[in-house]
Amino acid sequence: GSTVPPMVNVTRSEASEGNITVTCRASGFYPWNITLSWRQDGVSLSHDTQQWGDVLPDGNGTYQTWVATRICQGEEQRFTCYMEHSGNHSTHPVPSGNSHHHHHHHH
């Protein structure tokens, strides 16, 4: 089938005192091969500081997955979710605390 780019959505939630969890979700993409990871100051975080979900079918012939990491509150701006799919990439910052999501359909 043809390539379908993912919709990428970044959310944040309180984790523990002074920390937040940032989660990056990619959905609606085809084929299933995707790179999704967190970067700090432009550089990929090590694997052991990130948690990944499986790449799963979403019921529409496309796929979804997620990656999360825990960071210090106040450091959010240093982090971006990096997505790579079918030769294209995009970067997705963490929204500020008063706005909880960032939707971006990668073209």
Partner: antibody, heavy 117, light 107 residues
Framework: EVQLVQSGAEVKKPGASVKVSCKAS????????IEWVRQAPGQGLEWIGA????????NYNEKFKDRATLTADKSTNTAYLELSSLRSEDTAVYFC??????????WGQGTLVTVSS | DIQMTQSPSSLSASVGDRVTITCRAS??????LAWYQQKPGKAPKLLIY???TLADGVPSRFSGSGSGTDFTLTISSLQPEDFATYYC?????????FGQGTKVEIK
């Protein structure tokens, strides 16, 4: 010291193509995205696109998607911008820059591309 | 695309003056805004990122503020080397867009 050194000025005819290089030093080339920006004479700045030198994955401004090609050579730590089907309005200084998370921290010196018949 | 509107487009000031440049985004860009200084024939130089963080080596007379859609660059006491053109740039979403620039000239 982080440095981005670009190739020299080019003069091209309308309809031709140009390839501008950006050689990186002083950091791990494959760890950071390289961005491309242009500036027409006396005008503002315009983002063209970005490449991940490690994987070759790209992100283009829709305006340039049909004519711009971004590549990178890991063996020489060099990123390239090729712009095809040149027209007079492509006359500009073309800059490469390093993407440090959520801003551009280091820029090349710029390459003037002149399109004239 | 997010449009960035800078004002004024140019201004005349004297050494020692306090100068304020504003940048307005057409949508919420949180704090993902950078300010650059550019002199003729040179590449832009990063001054401020994340709306208010001073880049390394930039004098403390430069400061930035704002979030959401409205941002300000302030030069508290203009120095001879500050006469240049200043640009804002948003990093919330691609295409990354710049303001049209503000030229600071000698009165």
């Amino acid at each position: 010291e982080v440095q981005l050194v670009q190739s020299g000025a080019e003069v091209k005819k309308p309809g031709a193509s140009v390839k501008v290089s950006c050689k990186a030093s002083g950091y791990a080339f494959t760890n950071y995205l390289i961005e491309w920006v242009r500036q027409a004479p006396g005008q503002g700045l315009e983002w063209i696109g970005a490449i991940n030198p490690g994987s070759g994955a790209t992100n283009y401004n829709e305006k340039f998607k049909d004519r711009a090609t971004l590549t990178a050579d890991k063996s020489t730590n060099t990123a390239y911008l090729e712009l095809s089907s040149l027209r007079s309005e492509d006359t500009a200084v073309y800059f490469c820059a390093r993407f440090l998370g959520n801003y551009f921290d280091n820029w090349g010196q710029g390459t003037l591309v002149t399109v004239s018949s | 695309d997010i449009q960035m509107t800078q004002s004024p487009s140019s201004l005349s000031a004297s050494v020692g003056d306090r100068v304020t440049i504003t940048c307005r985004a057409s949508g919420n860009i949180h704090s993902y805004l950078a300010w650059y200084q550019q002199k003729p024939g040179k590449a832009p130089k990063l001054l401020i990122y994340y709306a208010e963080t001073l880049a390394d080596g930039v004098p403390s007379r430069f400061s930035g503020s704002g979030s959401g859609t409205d941002f300000t660059l302030t030069i508290s006491s203009l120095q001879p080397e500050d006469f240049a053109t200043y640009y804002c740039q948003q990093f919330w979403t691609t295409p990354y867009t710049f303001g049209q620039g503000t030229k600071v000239e000698i009165k």
